[in-house]
């Protein structure tokens, strides 16, 4: 009679994490008598996975009924596969012996690889805001995937970025892997509504990549432009001076009026106008009682935006151009008309 052969028909199989793996093994003869054992690995360090005769293997079930007299199918099913189960599995026939069974023949082995999905990519930007024309770095991380091969792309508003560096760790063997990528993005004044997207493609995702996003609104600071103008005279001794604060982001803004270098009023921006590009405009005005001044007045609009050093714009108010009337009711006190509206939206 022909000598028994142990047949493992699958050279390799690939299973998704969490699923069951079926490892096929058949023998070609019922002789010699003796059990089958399954091992992961070979040589003296091999690990027993299943023993037909003894032991407790809670994750392993046999595909066939091994108690049947003529059974030649010794395939097993391993449940709830994790990346740690990867390796080469050998079906080994033992010959009945005393006191121990003797290894008789081994199958050629089945390599089990485990597919594990990457976690949702997490994109994080710089800790501090940056202004247009500056380059900022974004990082993208995804973990827990297997096999190691993975593709990562960066986009800004749908346009693919090319300035990035990606590492997959560890460099050597592991049950699962992580990817870390850093992209450099140049900010523009129009980026308040922009998004940076990290896209990860992996064999486990069936062509439907995972995406992580970051809004540039969390990263960008667009500093305001200031314009101070003198409006036509509203009353005989009053001049309306406005400070237009334009195209700034984020909203956090404090404005201070200075009269000849002295603080006259401080206010926090409210009732802002939003531009199409996501930046804001705001206007503050001031009524100046000209008759209270003998000399020319230097009015300064000073703006502190998002905690940054203040920027300012000044306007010289010529008092000589407004002759004082003796009968005007100019009460002593501040030259700013406190009864006037303090601000408004422009």
């Amino acid at each position: 009679e022909e000598e028994l052969q142990v047949i493992q028909p699958d050279k390799s199989i690939s299973v998704a994490a969490g699923e069951s793996a079926t490892l096929h093994c058949t023998v070609t003869s019922l002789i010699p008598v003796g059990p089958i054992q399954w091992f992961r690995g070979a040589g003296p360090g091999r690990e027993l996975i299943y023993n037909q005769k003894e032991g407790h293997f809670p994750r392993v079930t046999t595909v066939s009924d091994l108690t049947k007299r003529n059974n030649m199918d010794f395939s097993i099913r391993i449940s709830n596969i994790t990346p740690a189960d990867a390796g080469t599995y050998y079906c080994v026939k033992f010959r009945k012996g005393s006191p121990d069974h003797v290894e008789f023949k081994s199958g050629a082995g089945t390599e089990l690889s485990v597919r594990a999905k990457p976690s949702a990519p997490v994109v994080s930007g710089p800790a501090a805001r940056a202004t247009p024309q500056h380059t900022v770095s974004f990082t993208c991380e995804s973990h827990g995937f297997s096999p190691r091969d993975i593709t990562l792309k960066w986009f800004k508003n749908g346009n693919e970025l090319s300035d990035f560096q990606t590492n997959v760790d560890p460099a050597g063997d592991s049950v699962s892997y992580s990817i870390h990528s850093t992209a450099k993005v140049v900010l523009t004044r129009e980026d308040v509504h922009s998004q940076v997207i990290c896209e990860v493609a992996h064999v486990t995702l069936q062509g439907d990549p995972l995406r992580g996003t970051a809004n540039l609104s969390e990263t960008i600071r667009v500093p305001p432009t200031l314009e101070v103008t003198q409006q036509p005279v509203r009353a005989e001794n009053q001049v309306n001076v406005t400070c237009q604060v334009r195209k700034f982001y984020p909203q956090r803004l404090q404005l201070t009026w200075l009269e000849n270098g002295n603080v006259s009023r401080t206010e926090t921006a409210s009732t802002l106008t939003e531009n199409k590009d996501g930046t804001y405009n705001w206007m503050s005005w001031l009524l100046v009682n000209v008759s209270a001044h003998r000399d020319d007045v230097k009015l300064t609009c000073q703006v502190e935006h998002d905690g940054q050093p203040a920027v300012s714009k000044s306007h010289d108010l010529k008092v000589s151009a407004h002759p004082k009337e003796q009968g005007s009711n100019t009460a002593p006190g501040p030259a700013l008309a406190s009864a006037a509206p303090l601000g408004g939206s422009g």
Epitope: R40, G41, A42, G43, P44, G45, R46, E47, A86, G87, T88, Y90, V92, R95, V102, E103, F104, K105, S106, G107, A108, G109, G172, D173
Partner: antibody
Framework: QVQLQESGPGLVKPSETLSLTCTVS????????WSWIRQPPGKGLEWIGF???????FYQSSLKSRVTISLDTSKNQFSLKMTSVTAADTAVYYC????????????????WGQGTTVTVSS | DIVMTQSPLSLPVTPGEPASISCRSS???????????LDWYLQRPGQSPQLLIY???SRASGVPDRFSGSGSGTDFTLKISRVEAEDVGVFYC?????????FGQGTKVEIK
């Protein structure tokens, strides 16, 4: 093509610990045994021990109390630590890969590092 | 431990001529599966050893076919059908059936 590279100090003082690292490049750690073998000057080969990819270790019984082999699969490296060295430990130390296809035995030490000379002297 | 014994310890050879090295193990290297756990290595001067033969008779990748291994149980032979100048060095047999792995003392092959 798999290559192995030993690294570590060439000179160790008596009673100190010898530490060597072997870096595996161009291949996988999985399914192989990773071995340390030494060759004293003018003598034959002596197996020190090996580690399987699953972390199981096997040592030469005469060296077992002094030797530890460890594996860092994430870096594709394995290491040898030998404590309380004496002049008798002076040798060329090789790291090597041992194949295991099936069964209980092994299928040849098929890849060797170039060897690193370790001298034990004060 | 399995003891490996080689003979001769020194072998002067003539290029183009055949050569033979014997190796004996203190216990059988033929496993119950029918596999022989016996390997042959060549260490050229100043180099690391290289695997020539594994499993008693299988040539390792890239090894010229002038090298052949035979034998089973406890007695093994490495044959070189036609010695070439590059074959000089020390030949070792080694067993891989059980730990500790052990090697023969080595056979030094040199040109006459």
């Amino acid at each position: 093509q798999v290559q192995l590279q030993e690294s570590g100090p060439g000179l160790v003082k008596p009673s100190e610990t010898l530490s060597l690292t072997c870096t595996v490049s161009g291949g996988s750690i999985r399914d192989y045994y990773w071995s340390w073998i030494r060759q004293p000057p003018g003598k034959g080969l002596e197996w020190i021990g090996f580690i399987y990819y699953n972390g199981r270790t096997f040592y030469q019984s005469s060296l077992k109390s002094r030797v530890t082999i460890s594996l860092d699969t994430s870096k594709n490296q394995f290491s040898l630590k030998m404590t309380s060295v004496t002049a008798a430990d002076t040798a060329v130390y090789y790291c090597a890969r041992v194949r295991a296809y099936s069964g209980i035995g092994l299928d040849g030490t098929d890849v060797w590092g170039q060897g690193t000379t370790v001298t034990v002297s004060s | 431990d399995i003891v490996m014994t080689q003979s001769p310890l020194s072998l002067p050879v003539t290029p183009g001529e055949p050569a033979s090295i014997s190796c004996r193990s203190s216990q059988s290297l033929l496993y119950s599966t029918g596999y022989t756990y016996l390997d042959w290595y060549l260490q050229r001067p100043g180099q690391s050893p290289q695997l020539l033969i594994y499993g008693g008779s299988s040539r390792a990748s890239g090894v010229p076919d002038r090298f052949s291994g035979s034998g089973s149980g406890t007695d093994f032979t490495l044959k070189i059908s036609r010695v070439e100048a590059e074959d000089v060095g020390v030949f070792y047999c080694g067993q891989a059936l059980q730990t500790p792995l052990t090697f023969g003392q080595g056979t030094k092959v040199e040109i006459k």
